[in-house]
Amino acid sequence: GWVWNQFFVPEEMNTTSHHVGRLRSDLDNGNNSFQYKLLGAGAGSTFIIDERTGDIYAIEKLDREERSLYILRAQVIDITTGRAVEPESEFVIKVSDINDNEPKFLDEPYEAIVPEMSPEGTLVIQVTASDADDPSSGNNARLLYSLLQGQPYFSVEPTTGVIRISSKMDRELQDEYWVIIQAKDMIGQPGALSGTTSVLIKLSDVNDNKPIFKESLYRLTVSESAPTGTSIGTIMAYDNDIGENAEMDYSIEEDDSQTFDIITNHETQEGIVILKKKVNFEHQNHYGIRAKVKNHHVDEQLMKYHTEASTTFIKIQVEDVDEP
């Protein structure tokens, strides 16, 4: 019968040829009366056989990632009779893996949005690299992820590629971060190949800033002839947040005379001081009122940032009009 061994040939060999192994019949007594033949896809072009000895050689460079095994057929003939000594038999030559492929991030570009002030450990995004080498061949395709850029705000789990927050970030200081992740095969051992990817992490706004008046004192004037509903001036607060988190409502906190009102212009985020009751210079020529400003939308969980509303003082001078 045939004497079989497992046949392996390393991929990407840089020698002209490589001895793969030997086909042998146990009837072969070594007197050179047998002729071995190789048939099938790759016979004669990728693999050749020494017909006298049955030695098989790979005669071209192989790429396991292109083709990982060859199914060939073996024959052995008695030269003296021309007859087959053994039944034709199929056998396999496996191409063994070398670490010739670097990890690649196939889902680039990566982009993630995470709320500012998120706590440590918050999951941002998972990046995944793939390696074309054989996962069952040692550590050739076993990857380890590491952070090349992004400390101290981010960390990456070495085996999963999960990026997490490792330090709170304030959008009002910096609103986006570029994180660079490296994937190394061979679980990072010497001789490892690596690939990198960039992740753009944008911070979404949370309402962690209350509106604050630009001025602690506003001076306005109103003519005693002004009808009710007259706009007598504007006041303005600023809020470092953006979008709806910066929307604000102005209101009167203190006006004993109940002469004025404040309405909010939601387009400009200004407070408009309105005359609610007519004024009389001869009766009272100046008023002092206090206004306050609050965000329009405040999340319950963020109330700690909004405990005390910002206030400002408005001094209003009444202008005299000559009366007949």
Epitope: N14, T15, H19, G44, T53, I59
Partner: antibody, heavy 121, light 107 residues
């Protein structure tokens, strides 16, 4: 008896082309690798190119890569070397040589007498 | 590429003497080395392949040895037909490369 007979050499101007042939007999041509080796006047041997049996794989010396093309015709048992953009440094006797068996597949066990290529203006 | 260095360049010996030719490879080529003989006006002739296997028809006085980077061709007793130029050649890596040759001449 294995025999190799080269032809196609001659005098050519720099930048010109030539096609060398090597007619083989006495063996199963498609089962062996074939080589071209050259020898400049008074110099040593220099490998030029190799083709595997059946023509699946070809290899070239850096000095001729992109200019020379090796090929074979199994039906005619003939090896060829197409030489383009010839230079004075290509002047030599060009030998074809048959590959061996097994581990000596990319060897040179039988040589032809050679054909002379002269590149000169 | 693998550089093959032969020494000596010329060897002057008498009939019946022992000739020892050396060939060194710039890196290991295992046993994938061949030796050729060339006489003036003739094609090279294969003597040895696989570092030590004699080609068909080569007399027993011609022998090869070595592996890795150091190789030797020995002709135990020089005959008149042995005076020629000898080349070593590696076939382990592309490009295939030859040594510069050793001329064995009559003293």
């Amino acid at each position: 008896e294995v025999q190799l007979l080269e032809s196609g050499g001659g005098l050519v101007q720099p930048g010109g082309s030539l096609r060398l042939s090597c007619a083989a007999s006495g063996f199963t041509f498609s089962s062996y690798a074939m080589n071209w080796v050259r020898q400049a006047p008074g110099k040593g041997l220099e490998w030029v190119s190799t083709i595997s049996g059946g023509g699946a794989n070809t290899y070239y010396a850096d000095s001729v890569k992109g200019r020379f093309t090796i090929s074979s015709d199994n039906s005619k048992s003939t090896l060829y070397l197409q030489m383009n953009s010839l230079r004075a440094a290509d002047t030599a006797v060009y030998h074809c040589a048959k590959g061996g068996m097994g581990g000596y597949y990319y060897g040179m066990d039988v040589w032809g007498q050679g054909t002379t290529v002269t590149v000169s203006s | 590429e693998i550089v093959m260095t032969q020494s000596p360049v010329t060897l002057s010996l008498s009939l019946g003497e022992r000739a020892t030719l050396s060939c060194r490879a710039s890196q290991s080529i295992s046993s994938n080395l061949a030796w050729f003989q060339q006489k003036p006006g003739q094609a090279p002739r294969l003597l040895i392949y696989g570092a030590f296997t004699r080609a068909t028809g080569i007399p027993a006085r011609v022998s090869g040895s070595g592996s890795g980077t150091e190789f030797t061709l020995t002709i135990s007793s020089l005959q008149s037909e042995d005076f020629a130029v000898y080349y070593c050649q590696q076939y382990n890596y592309w490009p295939l490369t030859f040594g510069g040759g050793t001329k064995v001449e009559i003293k």
